[in-house]
């Protein structure tokens, strides 16, 4: 027997669509081999109608497709605009039609129910509004107008011009009779429900002279849009519900096994804790449309999502919705990296951010996720060099190591730095990733003086102590600026105004500025790295003042052990007043908002990096 499985019988009516799902064992060969849907002819041959290699027969052009979901071991054949001619025997299969693995499917398309002559068909999505037009003759103008719903052989009054409203339609229906001369009345039904589906009868007058008009109302549930994203990547749900609900609370919810819908996020401030740090609901446009970004996708995020509008911020029958079916591909192109990075107070973290390696020229960004209201993510740093004022001297975005990864270094950590951060680019938005920074107990490994004042024209030495475990690492000093941290030349590069002198025995790397100039004022970082992978850093601010006493100034190693002087830098990270969340780059699909799913860790150079999911920023 064939291991391929699917529905043995599929039945529908003319004009409808079917979605036929075929299951196969997800072996490596099966996942990548050709998938097909073919029709069995009288000769026994099976003629391909659509395949995974892009072939679509002329009979199916514009109305059918085949989508493979290799990680689930399924493929789906969608066929729209069915006609009676589509009835027949088919096969869904893998490989070659004549001798591959396949499953027999019988499709029966019957004629839709016969509608009375002159019936007007109204096809409307659930939650939307329909206006049923009912013409009448002059003699019936003064008489009662009514709309009935046909249920079996009986007719149930829905609304009439004597102010009767059926309780099932309360507060969402109105009958409009125009001024004299217009021989048509209309019935408007808002917030359509699935149960409103059916045949209606307009009536004006009574007796043999009455006017009647049939209306067939088809209320459609939105067909879920299939969304196929990579594990650890990002998805954006764009939700456009129409102007009628522009000022109503919006939500995104996920359908559970009981077929109720659990709120994921809404504009009333509710958010599912499973999405903490990895979801944003962007501000609405004037037309009421909005989008929701989820980063760090997990397998358990799979499912059916609905967006909608209702004053309660949750799903209610009869309000407009949009639907998606999210599949999360485990064969992800997005590299696995830690989702948590740990650092100690006063220490540093180095975060590796993945981006699509085909987009090396894209602009890179890093933002801080804030959970208040709908969530926002103000930009802290970007590759063009802008850094939020509060992060001056302690935050840098480096293009290294390149080839699909950039690095963000944050030092002078405080407990207020704990939280979720997103890596962004203005390229492939599916590569947004999220990392959580945790501040743990411990001491920074690199020790530098807290506050240094240099004298113009003299020599300045700044020591940086490092532990033995870093002795094999490359040590460097660099001068921090908005655009990065410019490495200072080492001693063997010849005489220079600024050079690095390292005494391995004393486990000390010193920065020498000789002579000190006004331009030397600013932030300097001492750091360790292995190749292009950055480890811990420590920052020191150098102030430059006029000469007072003769002689060179040397900051003794003893002083280097002192804790950084709190007066030099306000280490508390104040709330950032940033317009980044309104920045179209954060929500324009072709531009920003990246997710740092499982993020590369704090000190890549650190020996005691904890696990593949967590990485220490500073070792104890």
């Amino acid at each position: 027997k064939s291991p391929v499985f699917g529905p043995q019988e599929v039945s529908s009516v003319e004009g409808n669509s079917v979605s036929i799902k075929c299951y196969y064992p997800p072996t490596s060969v099966n996942r990548h081999t050709r998938k097909y849907w073919c029709r069995k002819g009288a000769s026994g041959r099976c003629i391909t109608l659509v395949s995974s290699e892009g072939y679509v027969s002329s009979n199916y052009a514009g109305r059918a497709n085949l989508t493979n979901f290799p990680e689930n071991g399924t493929f789906v054949v969608n066929i729209a605009q069915l006609s009676r001619d589509d009835s027949g025997h088919y096969k869904c299969g893998l490989g070659i039609n004549s001798r591959g693995l396949s499953f027999d499917v019988s499709l029966e398309v019957s004629q839709g129910p016969e509608l009375p002559n002159g019936t007007e068909v109204y096809t409307v999505d659930v939650g939307r509004t329909v206006t049923i037009k009912c013409p009448f003759k002059t003699e019936n103008a003064p008489k009662t107008k009514a709309l009935y719903k046909k249920i079996g052989q009986t007719s149930v009054l829905v609304i009439d011009s004597r102010n009767y409203v059926n309780p099932n339609y309360k507060d969402r229906i109105r009958l409009r009779i125009p001024g004299t001369g217009q021989l048509i009345f209309t019935v408007v039904i808002d917030r359509l429900r699935l149960s409103d589906h059916g045949l209606y009868l307009c009536q004006a007058g009574d007796g043999s002279n009455r006017d009647e008009k049939n209306a067939d109302l088809q209320v459609l549930e939105p067909e879920p849009e299939l969304v196929y994203e990579d594990l650890r990547g990002s998805v954006t749900f764009h939700c456009a519900l129409g102007l009628e609900v522009a000022n109503v609370a919006k939500f995104l919810c996920r359908v559970n096994s009981r077929e109720t819908c659990d709120v994921v996020i809404n504009t009333l401030g509710k958010r599912d804790s499973a999405f903490e740090g990895r979801i944003l609901l962007n501000p609405q446009d004037k037309d009421g449309s909005f989008s929701v970004v989820i980063t760090g996708l997990r397998k358990e995020d799979e499912g059916r999502y609905l967006c909608g509008a209702h004053s309660d911020g949750q799903l209610q029958e009869g309000w407009p919705i949009q639907a998606w079916q999210l599949f999360v591909n485990e064969e992800s192109t997005i590299p696995r990296s830690p989702t948590v990075v740990k650092g100690v107070a006063g220490g540093s973290v180095a975060v590796l951010c993945p981006y699509n390696p085909k987009e090396s020229q894209s602009l890179k960004y890093w933002c801080l996720w804030e959970g208040a209201q709908n969530g926002r993510c103000p930009l802290l740093v970007e590759s063009q060099g802008l850094v939020q004022e509060q992060y001056e001297g302690r935050l840098s975005l480096l293009q290294e190591p390149g080839n699909g990864t950039f690095t963000v270094i944050l030092n002078q950590l405080t407990t207020q730095d704990a939280g979720f951060y997103w890596c962004l680019t203005n390229g492939d938005t599916r590569w947004r990733t999220t990392v959580e920074i945790k501040i743990i107990e411990g001491e920074p490994n690199l020790k530098v003086p807290g506050n240094v004042t240099a004298v113009l024209g003299e020599t300045l030495n700044i020591p940086c102590h490092f532990p033995c475990k870093f002795s094999s690492y490359e040590k460097y000093w660099c001068k921090w600026s908005n655009t990065g941290c410019q490495t200072l030349p080492s001693q063997d590069e010849g005489p220079s105004e600024a050079f690095v002198n390292c005494d391995e025995n004393s486990r000390l790397v010193s920065l020498t500025l000789n002579p000190v100039t006004r331009a030397d004022e600013g932030w300097y970082w001492c750091g360790v790295k292995q190749g292009h992978f950055y480890g811990e850093t420590a920052a020191v601010y150098v102030a430059v003042e006029e000469k007072k006493v003769a002689g060179s100034r040397y900051v003794s190693p003893a002083k280097a052990d002192a804790a950084p002087d709190e007066k030099v830098l306000d280490s508390g990270v104040r709330e950032i007043e940033n317009k980044a969340i309104q920045d179209p780059r954060l929500f324009a699909e072709e531009k920003v908002v990246a997710d740092t799913g499982d993020q590369a860790g704090g000190s890549r150079a650190s020996v005691d990096s904890s696990s593949s999911e967590e990485q220490g920023g500073s070792s104890k």
Epitope: S12, V13, K21, G112, G303
Partner: nanobody, 131 residues
Framework: EVQLVESGGGLVQAGGSLRLSCAAS??????????MGWFRQAPGKEREFVSA???????????YYADSMKGRLTISRDNAKNTVYLQMNSLKPEDTAVYYC???????????????????WGQGTQVTVSS
């Protein structure tokens, strides 16, 4: 909460037929929005898939049958009565088992043979086929 009550089981001779019924109650949703089906469990064996019926809308449905019983089963439902039926023909002694009615609101997004995806199970009805 959906309640499922099976009936129609019993003792039948090999080659005979049975029609199992499963009445559903307690749902606030329309009955057609549930996938309904049947599993069975023979003594000392795992529960196995028998058949399932999924409705996409009022007029579109998909019927699934286990390979081992293909050609001998017909699943159907009466939406007005909130009941699903399983017509079993040409019964064999190896069809002896407890037959369970199942339901789920998950729609078309899962493999109907996966018993973990069904949220509601009936108490079961015994079918015994004698030789």
């Amino acid at each position: 909460e959906v309640q499922l009550v099976e009936s129609g089981g019993g003792l039948v001779q090999a080659g005979g037929s049975l029609r199992l019924s499963c009445a559903a109650s307690g749902s606030g949703r329309t009955f057609t929005s549930y996938t309904m089906g049947w599993f069975r469990q023979a003594p000392g064996k795992e529960r196995e898939f028998v058949s399932a019926l999924t409705w996409a809308d009022d007029s579109t449905y998909y019927k699934y049958y286990a390979d081992s019983m293909k050609g001998r089963l017909t699943i159907s439902r009466d939406n007005a009565k909130n009941t699903v039926y399983l017509q079993m023909n040409s019964l064999k002694p190896e069809d002896t088992a407890v037959y369970y009615c199942v339901a789920t609101g998950r729609g078309l997004t899962y493999d109907p043979r996966d018993r973990r995806k069904y949220d509601y199970w009936g108490q079961g009805t015994q079918v015994t086929v004698s030789s």
